[in-house]
């Protein structure tokens, strides 16, 4: 029997009946065995076919078989109902070998020319399977010349049988307090030859509850308990299962915080698997009862391990643990069923006793000593001598625990001294130096420190004076002895004040004229204002209208009198303002240098002399009455004059205060 070529030779060729293309003889039998390489098959087709036709091809025939299977028995020239001729058909071996048998019987009614066929090896596409047949590979099939290989989707690994995809379904750890887990691909059929391990691992104190949901379908056996595929549940206390079949297992209350679920499958079957919804529970904590005037959030039916609640107080109430304030409060339920901290109180906000108001008082409006939320107090300043600055003095205890004004201020109001009050009323005429009476010049300050000088009280902690009067003490402010509230220079009854700092105008040059002869003394404490101690006002912008030529100002002090001694009693003199040009001219004659009188000075006195300030009065105020406000203000500071006080044709020269308002305001606001 002729054999066809064998692999590894090239597998292709031609076959023909004996004597082809001539007629074939009777009683012939010829057999060809063709063999292709592994992974290949043989393809065969006829280019000529002419055999005797007989019922079921019993006489002459060509038979094609592959292994034990007959692929075709062929005869005739064209197919009939019961016989088959190849026509244009192509025949394929089932494996890598193909047997071709030609036979002719003892006679032919007429001559037949037989057949001619061509064959070739071709790659088998193992990935192509007939409908109804099991697929070659579980997931992906890849054909190549001479063979194929299988691969798997992500999450699977190829089994050692090289065709099955086993699920990579181990090592998943669930740590949430509830969740779902299921067999791979659920609700589609689960993979074969897989071993899955799932862990639920919760914090100590939790207990896992397992509920099987939706459907349960795991391959089973009628007699043996889960021999093929099975599901097992293991805790540190006990094992549940194995489970298989189609019935949903009952709820499992594990009483454990750790659970291991094992699912094992074999190589066969087509089942949808399972789905578990797990929850957890723990020993509940006592139900939190909100404190009065507070509420709990969130509200839950019960609170278990790790659950928490916060307390929020109503407006006007605050969280307190005893006397200690808390901005927020959150308690967490512990594994032993207790809260990690005790419940605070929501106490009504208490703003506490209001601060004392210097030079003022406070009145409880809501009720005596009531300082809690929404309570009202009223600050007021001591009448006559103080006035309230900025607000109306009404404060409310707000939810933040601070007394707050109607303008939203949390700071105290300020009682500012009333300035420019005097017991004295001025007349229009000029008369000689007079003794001052109590309350006439309550701003008058006596400055002792090397020499005797004067000053005027501003606000309740500043003194306005002349630079030349305190120049020597500018670096030793504490050396200044400052007295006020007295008329008698040598009286032991006075209010003592001490200097904290001396501010001399930066434009003042000592012993080189008296331009910018102005200074401020900051007192180290505020003085109490009364009828004998009251500040002088600073001039308003409009003050120039009360300081024109011939307007009357009043100078006061303990300076030299006509007798040549310092006055024992405070003296004052009413003097008119002198025309500036006239004054300038008066001091242009020797011994005075040109330019002695500057625009920062004003002059006052009589042309005839006799009324003047003198040594010892330096730094004191030349004051004027503002007829609109009915308050006295400082227009000048006693600065310099002729060597002989009260000399005819000479005048007292005063620092013009209105030129220095910005300087004064800056110093006071900065310090």
């Amino acid at each position: 029997t002729p054999l066809g070529p064998k692999w590894p030779e090239p597998v292709f060729g031609r076959l023909a009946s004996p004597g082809f293309p001539g007629e074939y003889a009777n009683d012939q039998e010829r057999r060809w065995t063709l063999t292709a390489p592994p992974g290949y098959r043989l393809r065969l087709y006829f280019t000529h076919f002419d055999l005797e036709l007989s019922h079921l091809c019993e006489y002459d025939f060509v038979k094609l078989s592959s292994g034990a299977k007959v692929l075709a028995t062929l005869c005739g020239q064209e197919s009939t109902d019961t016989e088959r001729a190849p026509g244009k058909d192509t025949f394929y071996s089932l494996g890598s070998s193909l047997d071709i048998t030609f036979r002719s019987d003892y006679s032919n009614e007429k001559p037949f020319t037989g057949f001619e066929a061509f064959y070739a090896a071709e790659d088998i596409d193992e990935c192509q399977v007939a409908p109804g047949e099991a697929p070659t590979c579980d997931h992906h099939c890849h054909n190549h010349l001479g063979g194929f290989y299988c691969s798997c989707r992500a999450g699977y690994v190829l089994h050692r049988n090289k065709r099955t995809c086993s699920a990579l379904c181990s090592g998943q750890v669930f740590t949430q307090r509830s969740g779902e887990l299921s067999s791979p691909e659920y609700p589609r059929p689960y993979p074969k030859l897989s071993s899955c391990t799932y862990s639920i691992s919760l914090e100590e104190g939790f207990s896992v509850i397992l509920d099987f949901v939706e459907s349960f379908d795991v391959e089973t056996h009628p007699e043996t308990l889960c021999p093929y595929d099975f599901l097992k549940i293991q805790t540190d206390r006990e094992e549940h299962g194995p489970f298989c079949g189609k019935t949903l297992p009952h709820r499992i209350e594990t009483k454990s915080n750790t659970v291991t679920i094992t699912f094992v499958t074999d190589e066969s079957g087509d089942h949808t698997g399972w789905k578990i919804h797990y929850t957890s529970t723990a020993q509940p904590c006592p139900y939190p009862m909100a404190p009065p005037n507070g509420h709990v959030s969130p509200v839950q039916a019960k609170y278990i391990l790790k659950d928490s609640f916060s307390i929020f107080c109503e407006t006007g109430y605050e969280l307190l643990q005893g006397h200690l304030p808390l901005k927020s409060f959150t308690a967490v339920c512990q594994k032993d069923g207790s809260w990690d901290r005790p419940m605070p109180a929501c106490s009504i906000v208490d703003c506490g006793p209001p601060d004392d108001l210097p030079s003022g008082r406070v009145e409880y409006i809501t009720g005596p000593g009531v300082t809690t939320y929404k309570a009202v107090i009223q600050y007021s300043c001591e009448e006559t001598f103080y006035t309230m600055k900025v607000n109306d003095g009404k404060y409310v205890c707000e939810a933040d625990g601070f007394w707050t004004s109607s303008k939203g201020e949390k700071s105290l109001p300020v009682c500012e001294p009333v300035c420019g009050l005097s017991a004295r009323t001025t007349g229009g005429r000029i008369y000689g130096g007079q003794k001052a009476k109590p309350g006439d010049f309550p701003w008058q300050v006596l400055i002792l420190g090397g020499t005797t000088a004067a000053g005027a009280l501003l606000y309740d902690n500043w003194v306005l004076t002349a630079a030349h009067a305190v120049y020597e003490q500018k670096h030793d402010a504490s050396a200044l002895d400052i007295r006020m509230g007295t008329l008698k220079r040598l009286s032991p009854h006075y209010t003592q004040a001490w200097s904290e700092a001396v501010f001399i105008h930066e434009g003042y040059t000592h012993d080189a004229g008296f331009d910018n002869d102005i200074a401020l003394i900051k007192l180290n404490n505020k003085v109490v204002i009364n009828s004998n101690i009251t500040p002088i006002c600073l001039p308003r912008k409009e003050a120039e209208s009360f300081m024109r030529t011939d307007d009357i100002g009043t100078a006061s002090g303990w300076g030299l009198t006509q007798r040549g001694f310092l006055a024992r009693n405070l003296m004052y003199v009413d003097i008119p303002i002198v025309d500036h040009q006239k004054c300038t001219a008066a001091y242009e004659k020797p011994p005075y240098p040109r330019g002695s009188v500057t625009a920062n000075m004003l002059c006052a006195g009589l042309e005839s002399g006799g009324k003047d300030s003198c040594r010892g009065d330096s730094g004191g105020a030349l004051v004027f009455l503002d007829s609109e406000t009915e308050r006295w203000f400082v227009g000048g500071i006693v600065s310099w004059g002729s060597m002989n006080c009260g000399e005819a044709g000479q005048y007292g020269v005063y620092t013009k205060v209105i030129n220095y308002i910005p300087w004064i305001e800056n110093i006071i606001s900065d310090f």
Partner: antibody
Framework: DVQLQESGPGLVKPSQSLSLTCTVT?????????WNWIRQFPGNKLEWMGY???????SYNPSLKSRISITRDTSKNQFFLHLNSVTTEDTATYFC?????????WGQGTPLTVSS | DIVMTQSQKFMSTSVGDRVSVTCKAS??????VAWYQQKPGQSPKALIY???YRYSGVPDRFTGSGSGTDFTLTISNVQSEDLAEYFC?????????FGAGTKLELK
């Protein structure tokens, strides 16, 4: 990590004023709780002086109310103790501490001697 | 002012013993009491707050109990590092006050 650190002069003369600073790191003094000054006298007796709360409100020991003031600088996360008219009786180690529910931290303390 | 009385200035103990430090308030302070441990040259360290709640990091051999006026700090299985002074502290009302301290020492 919450840390408190006191700083101050160490020695003060009688009748003078005392100022101490507590610098806080690791937590904002405006976030929560009460920020306290506590002192420990020789012999280990502890005395609470007062606190300034997260909101800036103060509470003082009535025995010191006329002399004490507690303030803060939120930009520097510091709070301060001011004590006027000190006497030798104020000689102690001064601690700043935050006291609150489940939140308790103390500084190392700064010794103060009042002596002429 | 609420006076916190620690009647025992000193207590002698041995390693492994159980010891109870007591504190009595002059008036009701609810459970607003803390316990502190202080070692020489160190600042006080909080052990217990609100009478019975242990601060994290504090060994569970320290337990606090009581409410109202009577409070106890119990140390079971005393260790050598527990030898220190213990203060009770009420934070119920102004002024906050401390006990005078109880010194734990070895027998």
């Amino acid at each position: 990590d919450v840390q408190l650190q006191e700083s101050g002069p160490g020695l003060v003369k009688p009748s003078q004023s005392l100022s101490l600073t507590c610098t806080v790191t690791g937590y904002s003094i405006t976030s929560d709780y009460a920020w306290n000054w506590i002192r420990q006298f020789p012999g280990n007796k502890l005395e609470w002086m007062g606190y300034i709360s997260y909101s800036g409100r103060t509470s003082y020991n009535p025995s010191l109310k006329s002399r004490i003031s507690i303030t803060r600088d939120t930009s520097k996360n510091q709070f301060f103790l001011h004590l006027n008219s000190v006497t030798t009786e104020d000689t102690a180690t001064y601690f700043c501490a935050v006291l609150g529910l489940y939140f308790d931290y103390w500084g190392q303390g700064t010794p103060l001697t009042v002596s002429s | 002012d609420i006076v916190m009385t620690q009647s025992q200035k000193f207590m002698s103990t041995s390693v492994g013993d159980r010891v109870s430090v007591t504190c009595k308030a002059s008036q009701n302070v609810d459970t607003n009491v803390a316990w502190y441990q202080q070692k020489p040259g160190q600042s006080p360290k909080a052990l217990i707050y609100s009478a019975s709640y242990r601060y994290s990091g504090v060994p569970d051999r320290f337990t606090g109990s009581g409410s109202g006026t009577d409070f106890t700090l119990t140390i079971s299985n005393v260790q050598s590092e527990d030898l220190a002074e213990y203060f009770c502290h009420q934070f119920n009302s102004n002024p906050l006050t401390f006990g005078a301290g109880t010194k734990l020492e070895l027998k």
